[in-house]
Interface confidence: medium
């Protein structure tokens, strides 16, 4: 599923991401835009043999199990395929664990490079939330 901007903002708010660990909803929508272009089925492979999955591009070395990543930790205790569902519950729950891990949203390279320090509220402007 490819979400619309406001559709995703509403879904993320319903799942309790607005101001989760101090990060406003705009940060999460911005991260999803530049990680996956709002596509729940996005996958991208990394040079270390891991793969990033889903709307927030969650990594298989640390956070989920795809059955084939060397030394996978699966800290969210889920199959990576669950992160590709049109229902973003699994991605949100895992993202909450990631953002609580110490580095905050810096865990997402795209957020660090494209969203951090920008007007992230623009990503929810005009949305009925």
């Amino acid at each position: 599923k490819v979400f619309g901007r406001c559709e995703l903002a509403a879904a993320m708010k319903r799942h309790g991401l607005d101001n989760y660990r101090g990060y406003s909803l705009g940060n999460w929508v911005c991260a999803a835009k530049f990680e996956s272009n709002f596509n729940t089925q996005a996958t991208n492979r990394n040079t270390d043999g891991s793969t990033d999955y889903g709307i927030l591009q969650i990594n298989s070395r640390w956070w989920c199990n795809d059955g084939r990543t060397p030394g996978s930790r699966n800290l969210c205790n889920i199959p990576c395929s669950a992160l590709l569902s049109s229902d973003i519950t699994a991605s949100v729950n895992c993202a909450k664990k990631i953002v609580s891990d110490g580095n905050g949203m810096n865990a997402w390279v795209a957020w660090r490079n494209r969203c951090k320090g920008t007007d992230v509220q623009a990503w929810i402007r005009g949305c009925r939330l």
Epitope: Q41, A42, G67, R68
Partner: antibody, heavy 116, light 107 residues
């Protein structure tokens, strides 16, 4: 138990296309990558690429881009590989395998012969 | 691409002998190396995963070792059913690659 059942042998003319199937049973098809491997005598085993059936995500070995196309049907638990513009170089045994990094589960192989 | 070089290409042995097959990677692949046996007209069969982990159902006479670039598959006291081709495969990076194979034949 996990099984992968491939379609039968094919004899094709040069320039034609062929679609090989791989039906999976015994596990959740959508959650594991399906890999495709080519074997020609004297050429060993070559990795063609992979598809994640649940999302349709595909990755191809550069060498096979434009030659192979992967699809999957989660309603029938079947993965497909189409090979186009066939030449004698495409004559080989083609295997599907479940992608766990290693390959514990293989299909029985589909023999493709390209001959005029 | 990571190249895997297997040696020797052919190994002629008598049942009861112990043998070692080599697989060398063109760059370090940690322990992300797997071994397969293939008999004529059959699909490959996984023997060892991650360099040294014996796959379930595989006889204990098979063992694997190595890390980085140099790997070895050992067969302690070869049996007649062990003759065939042996391939190594790396899962450290894409594209996945296989070695050219070692043929284990009866002397």
């Amino acid at each position: 138990q996990v099984q992968l059942q491939e379609s039968g042998a094919e004899v094709m003319k040069p320039g034609a296309s062929v679609k090989i199937s791989c039906k999976a049973t015994g596990y959740t098809f959508s959650t594991y990558w399906i890999e495709w491997v080519k074997q020609r005598p004297g050429h060993g085993l070559e990795w063609i690429g992979e598809i994640l059936p649940g999302s349709g995500s595909t990755y191809y070995n550069e060498k096979f881009k434009g030659k192979a196309t992967f699809t999957a049907d989660t309603s029938s638990n079947t993965a497909y590989m189409q090979l186009s513009s066939l030449t004698s170089e495409d004559s080989a045994v083609y295997y599907c395998a479940r992608g766990d990094g290693w390959y514990c589960y293989w299909g029985q192989g589909t023999t493709l012969t390209v001959s005029s | 691409d990571i190249e895997l070089t297997q040696s020797p290409a052919t190994l002629s042995v008598t049942p009861g002998d112990s043998v070692s097959l080599s697989c060398r990677a063109s760059q370090s692949i940690s322990n992300n190396l797997h071994w397969y046996q293939q008999k004529s007209h059959e699909s490959p069969r996984l023997l060892i995963k991650y360099a040294s982990q014996l796959q379930s159902g595989i006889p204990s006479r098979f063992s694997g070792s190595g890390s980085g670039t140099d790997f070895t598959l050992s067969i302690n006291s070869v049996e007649t059913e062990d003759f065939g081709m042996y391939f190594c495969q790396q899962s450290n990076s894409w594209p996945r690659t296989f070695g050219g194979g070692t043929k284990l034949e009866i002397k």
